[in-house]
Amino acid sequence: SEVEYRAEVGQNAYLPCFYTPAAPGNLVPVCWGKGACPVFECGNVVLRTDERDVNYWTSRYWLNGDFRKGDVSLTIENVTLADSGIYCCRIQIPGIMNDEKFNLKLVIKPAKVTPAPTRQRDFTAAFPRMLTTRGHGPAETQTLGSLPDINLTQISTLANELRDSRLANDLRDSGATIRIG
């Protein structure tokens, strides 16, 4: 089942996705699409990278992390209720059927009406409650049978909701990571 993330209307949503390049600058193409990951590619592509850089993007979707180091987490700016749904992060590893696919569910909640102004929150994300680690270390590492050189490391945190933009960097240490090479 999809990992669920939450954001409020008007905020920026953050959907984590990572891989570890085999060597600096040796990038693997990645696509983000709206809708569950299909057999190939991404459906309704909202952003794409190639071996060099981001080569397809639209106005509200961007990679704010260091994608050259494998942080291909998607930021959706100024979200609306229509942004709710499943998003696919696809790491397009060379070779037949080698792609890694992650389905992330984004739930957009109506903006809270607050009586007093509060500090702006840039990122909000909820993590599933059945998590296996309390820190930022790997919870488990499993070797993919068909890809002996690629490990899938799943990292999570127990926080139900990130409510402060200064936690964005912590968030980048969370999520799913593919190591290549």
Epitope: K34, E41, G43, N44, V45, D53, Y56, T58, S59, W62
Partner: antibody
Framework: QVQLQESGPGLVKPSQTLSLTCTVS??????????WTWIRQTPGKGLEWVGA???????YYSPSLKSRTSISRDTSKNQFTLQLSSVTPEDTGVYYC??????????WGQGTQVTVSS | QSALTQPPSVSGTLGKTVTISCAGT?????????VSWYQQLPGTAPKLLIY???KRASGIPDRFSGSKSGNTASLSISGLQSEDEADYYC??????????FGGGTKLTVL
């Protein structure tokens, strides 16, 4: 508000190279995520995307024009330039520069008429 | 022949709604949320109406709306006004970093 202004010769001889410049005001051509584009409107083919240069300097070209097209930029002058080589009368038309935050749409300049004739 | 297919002309009655279609493929309209619509009056540059399928450009009234279903995009104009008489073009990103346009639709307001 970003403003675009195309400039260049209105008349070019066949087999020569067409060179057009787009001067950008009200914003920098290196602004993150911006895409700076050339589009033309010809009597024969209607609106046709020619190519683009991204905020990063990376260029993209129409497959049908790629062999004849070059797009470059001068960040000190906040300009980007289209060069189209080996022109023929079929390249006659209005050439527009345009911009947007990504690939989702275009805000256009006013356009400049180019005629290819001997 | 244009890469995206639009009807050459449509007509609508003052105050009513008209819809212009734009047919593409899974490599452009169907695969990406980068459909845009433009209005061009005689002798002027195209003006952005809709970007990214359904987002109105700044200053565009909500009489103009965009949508997409499968490989076909649509522009709807409600409460037709005489000044809406113009040529309308669709465009879409296409795989491999290319952009394609429709052939244009001439809208006549009756």
């Amino acid at each position: 508000q970003v403003q675009l202004q195309e400039s260049g010769p209105g008349l070019v001889k066949p087999s020569q190279t067409l060179s057009l410049t787009c001067t950008v005001s009200g914003g920098s051509i290196t602004t993150n995520r911006y895409l700076w584009t050339w589009i033309r409107q010809t009597p024969g083919k209607g609106l046709e995307w020619v190519g683009a240069i991204a905020y990063s300097g990376r260029t993209y070209y129409s497959p049908s024009l790629k062999s004849r097209t070059s797009i470059s930029r001068d960040t000190s002058k906040n300009q980007f330039t289209l060069q189209l080589s080996s022109v023929t009368p079929e390249d006659t038309g209005v050439y527009y520069c345009a911009h947007f935050t990504g690939w989702g749409g275009y805000y256009w300049g006013q356009g400049t008429q180019v005629t290819v004739s001997s | 022949q244009s890469a995206l297919t639009q009807p050459p002309s449509v007509s609508g009655t003052l105050g009513k709604t008209v819809t212009i279609s734009c047919a593409g493929t899974s490599s452009d309209i169907g695969g990406y949320n980068s459909v845009s619509w433009y209005q061009q009056l005689p002798g002027t540059a195209p003006k952005l109406l809709i970007y990214e399928v359904n987002k109105r450009a700044s200053g565009i009234p909500d009489r103009f709306s965009g949508s997409k279903s499968g490989n076909t995009a649509s522009l709807s104009i409600s409460g037709l006004q005489s000044e809406d008489e113009a040529d309308y073009y669709c465009a879409s990103y296409r795989s491999a970093n290319n952009v394609v346009f429709g052939g244009g639709t001439k809208l006549t307001v009756l």
